[in-house]
Interface confidence: low
C-alpha cells in the first residue's frame, strides 16, 4: 500500500553508506521552506542491507542488484509516491572500496558501475555512487553530529532537549570507527595545523572553522583484527596461534590466503610453511592489549605531536562523540555510560575477555558467533586506540561521549554528505528569507 | 555448524490455531530471511512467507495473508508461524528455512512439522 | 505473482541423461541476474538446494547436475543418471519473494 503525499511542504533524501563490512541506507526528511535553518533535517528510516559490503561482490558484480532491492524497495515505502521523482539518491562507498581500488582500480570501477546502473532503476532522483575520501568521511561525520547537537545554531531554542547539555556554541570533535578506517575530526585550539592534509577550513552559517581531520586506513576495527593476526602468525612458532584477544576455549581456522588477501597486511606477509592456522583464544586483556599496541609506530613522528604512524595531531580539545562501531562494541559491553571511568573500562574488558567461550556463548544465545567472538579484541582495540593512539587520558576519558543517535538521527558521515550535496548547509547565517544558494561546504 | 530444530508433530481440530516454532543455532536468526513452507501428504512445495527478524518485518504470500502469522524472538534465536482458522486442507508438513540474501544459496532447512487437522 | 510451470514427470534409464523443464511467467531476471533455483527432494526428507542463481551448483552437489536458461525458460539436467537421483525436483524463483514449480517426478527404470 503505497502512501499518500503528505499535506505539508515536505522532502526527503536517501543516502546509502556503503561501508567495508554492509551497506545501510537512510532516509532524511525535512520541511521544504526551511531548508537553510540548522537542524531541521531527521532521518526517518535505517534499512541494514542484508549481506557483505559492497567491495566482496568484485566476484559477482551480478548479484548487486537483487542485494540493494529490499532496502530501496522499504524507500519506495517511505517515500510518498508523489516524491519519488524529486529525492535524490547518494551512495558513498568507505574504506573497503578504498581497498579495493588500491588493489585494483578497475575492479573497483566495475563494482561501482553495476551499483550505479542497479541504483538508475528506481524512481528516485540518482545522484551518482562514488568512493568518499577519509578526509571527506571525517569531515562529513564532524558536521553530521554539529548539526544534531545544534552548534551551527545562533538560536539556543531546542539546547534543553539535546542529549550532551554543553550550552555552548563549542563544537564536538569527531570519533569514527568502522570496519576498514577510523577518523578522528576536531577544531583544535589555537593551534596551527602542521600538516595540509589533515586541515579543513569552512564557513558555516556566517562562522569559521578550521578543522583538523585525518582518516587512518586499515585501522578499522576488522582490518586492524587481520592486522594483529598477520604480525603475530610470523612469530608463531607452527600452524597454533594462541591469542590472547579471543576468549578462553575459542578456536577458528584462518586461511594464510584469507589473512593476506587485504592490502593492510602486507607489511606483515611472508611465506608460511602451513596453508591453515588455528587461533586458541587465552583471554588475556593485558597481552591482547599489548599485542595491538606494536600496530602503532610511535618512534617516527616530523612534528610537534603525532597519533601514531607519523601522523600529526594537535591537542585535544573539547568534548568528543564516538560513533559507528565505537559506539556498538561499547553498547554491547555496556559501557557508553558517561559514569564509567577508563579505570572502569579497563576492568570490565579484562573480566570479559577472561570469560570462557561456551560461557559468552550461552550468556549472548542469539548473537552471531562471529560478532561475538570479536569483542575482546574490539574492546581492547577501541581502549588501545583512544589511550596511545590519540592520546585520551584518564582524565580526558570524560569528555568522550558514546553516541548512536542523536534526536532520532544516526551519528554517522551519511547526514553531513546530503546536507553538503543537497546545499543545505549555507556558508552565512540566514535571513529570515534563506539566502540565495551561493556559497556552501 | 548452523542448524534449523522445529517444535513436534500437532493434531488440531478444525477452526483452531496451531504455533509452530524453529530454533536456530549456530547463527544468529538476524542474519537471515526466515521462510516458511508447507507441504500437503502427495503434493509440491507452497511458500507461505518470510519475516526480517532484524526489523520484525513480514511478507505473507496473498493465500495466506489473513491467517498466518510469523513472529520471531531474536533472545532465543527461533522464529514461529502460527495459523489460525484451520481446515482440513492444511495438513501438511510445515518447513521453515533460511535464505541469507535474495537470491543466494538458500542455506538451511528445518526437519518439518507435521500438522494434522481432524475433526 | 510469478507463476512457474514443471513438466510432470519421467522416467530414465540409469547412466542417461535425465532433463527437467520449467516455464515462468513472468520473467525471473533481474537487473541481469536470474533468480531461478532448483531443489530435490526424497520422500521424508526436506527439500535439498542443487543450483541457485539459474546455473550455479549448491555447495556439495554432485557435477552430475547442472541447470541452464534465462528470463522464462529453464532447464535442470542430470548427466549421468543414478538409481539415488529417483525424487520430486521443484524449480523456484527467488526474484519476487518465493514461489516454487508443480514439481516433476523422475523414476529411474
Known amino acids: 500500500t503505497q502512501n499518500k503525499a503528505l499535506p505539508e511542504n515536505v522532502k526527503y533524501g536517501i543516502v546509502l553508506d556503503a561501508g567495508s563490512s554492509h551497506t545501510s541506507l537512510y532516509i532524511y526528511k525535512w520541511p521544504a521552506e526551511k531548508e537553510n535553518d540548522t537542524g531541521v533535517v531527521h532521518q526517518v528510516e535505517e534499512c541494514r542491507v542484508k549481506g557483505p559490503g559492497i567491495s566482496k561482490f568484485v566476484q559477482k558484480v551480478n548479484e548487486i542488484g537483487i542485494y540493494l532491492t529490499d532496502c530501496m524497495e522499504r524507500a519506495r515505502e517511505v517515500i510518498p509516491r508523489s516524491q519519488h521523482q524529486e529525492t535524490p539518491v547518494y551512495l558513498g562507498a568507505t574504506a573497503g572500496m578504498r581497498l579495493l581500488r588500491m588493489e585494483s582500480e578497475e575492479l573497483a570501477d566495475r563494482v561501482l558501475d553495476v551499483v550505479e546502473r542497479s541504483l538508475s532503476n528506481y524512481p528516485f532522483d540518482f545522484q551518482g555512487a562514488r568512493i568518499i575520501t577519509g578526509q571527506e568521511e571525517g569531515a562529513y561525520g564532524w558536521i553530521t553530529i554539529n548539526y544534531l547537537l545544534g552548534k551551527f545554531s545562533q538560536k539556543t531554542r531546542w539546547f534543553s532537549i539535546v542529549p550532551y547539555e554543553t550550552n555552548n556554541q563549542e563544537t564536538f570533535g569527531a570519533l569514527d570507527l568502522g570496519g576498514a578506517s577510523t577518523q578522528v575530526t576536531f577544531v583544535p585550539q589555537n593551534q596551527t595545523i602542521e600538516s595540509p592534509d589533515n586541515a579543513l577550513q569552512f564557513r558555516l552559517y556566517g562562522k569559521d572553522y578550521n578543522v583538523y581531520t585525518h582518516s587512518f586506513l586499515c585501522y578499522g576495527k576488522d582490518q586492524a583484527l587481520w592486522q594483529k593476526l598477520a604480525k603475530d602468525i610470523q612469530v608463531a612458532s607452527n600452524e597454533i596461534l594462541r591469542d590472547p584477544c579471543f576468549h578462553p576455549g575459542y578456536k577458528k581456522v584462518v586461511n594464510v590466503s584469507d589473512l593476506y588477501k587485504t592490502p593492510c597486511t602486507k607489511r606483515f606477509e611472508m611465506t608460511l610453511p602451513f596453508q591453515q592456522f588455528e587461533i586458541q583464544g587465552i583471554g588475556n586483556y593485558q597481552q591482547c592489549h599489548q599485542s595491538i599496541l606494536e600496530l602503532f609506530n610511535t618512534s617516527y613522528c616530523p612534528y610537534s605531536q603525532c597519533a601514531f604512524n607519523g601522523i600529526f595531531l594537535p591537542p585535544l580539545q573539547g568534548d568528543f562523540g564516538a560513533f559507528s562501531a565505537f559506539y556498538f562494541v561499547m553498547k554491547f559491553l555496556n559501557l557508553t555510560s558517561e559514569k564509567v571511568s577508563q579505570e572502569k573500562v579497563t576492568e570490565m574488558m579484562k573480566k570479559f575477555c577472561a570469560q570462557p567461550w561456551e560461557e559468552i556463548k550461552t550468556s549472548y544465545a542469539g548473537v552471531k558467533e562471529k560478532y561475538l567472538s570479536e569483542y575482546c579484541f574490539s574492546g581492547t582495540y577501541i581502549l588501545s586506540l583512544l589511550l596511545q593512539g590519540y592520546h585520551f587520558t584518564a582524565d580526558s576519558w570524560e569528555h568522550i561521549h558514546f553516541i548512536g543517535k542523536i534526536q532520532g538521527s544516526d551519528a554517522g558521515w551519511t547526514l553531513g554528505y546530503m546536507l553538503n550535496l543537497t546545499n543545505m548547509i549555507p556558508a552565512e547565517q540566514p535571513l529570515s528569507t534563506p539566502l540565495s544558494h551561493s556559497t556552501y561546504v | 555448524q548452523v542448524q534449523l530444530v522445529q517444535s513436534g508433530a500437532e493434531v488440531k481440530k478444525p477452526g483452531a490455531s496451531v504455533k509452530v516454532s524453529c530454533k536456530v543455532s549456530g547463527d544468529s536468526i538476524t542474519a537471515y530471511f526466515m521462510h516458511w513452507v508447507r507441504q500437503a501428504p502427495g503434493k509440491g512445495l507452497e511458500w507461505m512467507g518470510r519475516?526480517?527478524?532484524?526489523?520484525?518485518?513480514?511478507k505473507y504470500a496473498e493465500k495466506f495473508k489473513n491467517r498466518v502469522t510469523m513472529t520471531s524472538d531474536t533472545s532465543t534465536n527461533t522464529v514461529y508461524m502460527e495459523l489460525s482458522s484451520l481446515r482440513s486442507e492444511d495438513t501438511a508438513v510445515y518447513y521453515c528455512?533460511?535464505?541469507?540474501?535474495?537470491?543466494?544459496?538458500?542455506?538451511?532447512w528445518g526437519q518439518g512439522t507435521m500438522v494434522t487437522v481432524s475433526s | 505473482d510469478i507463476v512457474l510451470t514443471q513438466s510432470p514427470a519421467l522416467a530414465v534409464s540409469p547412466g542417461q541423461r535425465a532433463t527437467i523443464t520449467c516455464r515462468t511467467n513472468p520473467t525471473v531476471d533481474h537487473y541481469g541476474t536470474t533468480y531461478m533455483n532448483w531443489y530435490q527432494q526424497k520422500p521424508g526428507q526436506p527439500p535439498k538446494l542443487l543450483i541457485y542463481l539459474a546455473s550455479s551448483l549448491a555447495s556439495g552437489v554432485p557435477a552430475r547436475f547442472s541447470g541452464s536458461g534465462s528470463g522464462t525458460d529453464f532447464t535442470l539436467t542430470i548427466n549421468p543418471v543414478e538409481a539415488n537421483d529417483t525424487a520430486n525436483y521443484y524449480c523456484q524463483q527467488s526474484r519476487n519473494l518465493w514461489t516454487f514449480g508443480g514439481g516433476t517426478k523422475v523414476e529411474i527404470k
Open positions: 528455512a533460511t535464505e541469507r540474501v535474495p537470491g543466494f544459496e538458500t542455506d538451511y
Open positions: 519475516i526480517d527478524p532484524d526489523h520484525e518485518r513480514t
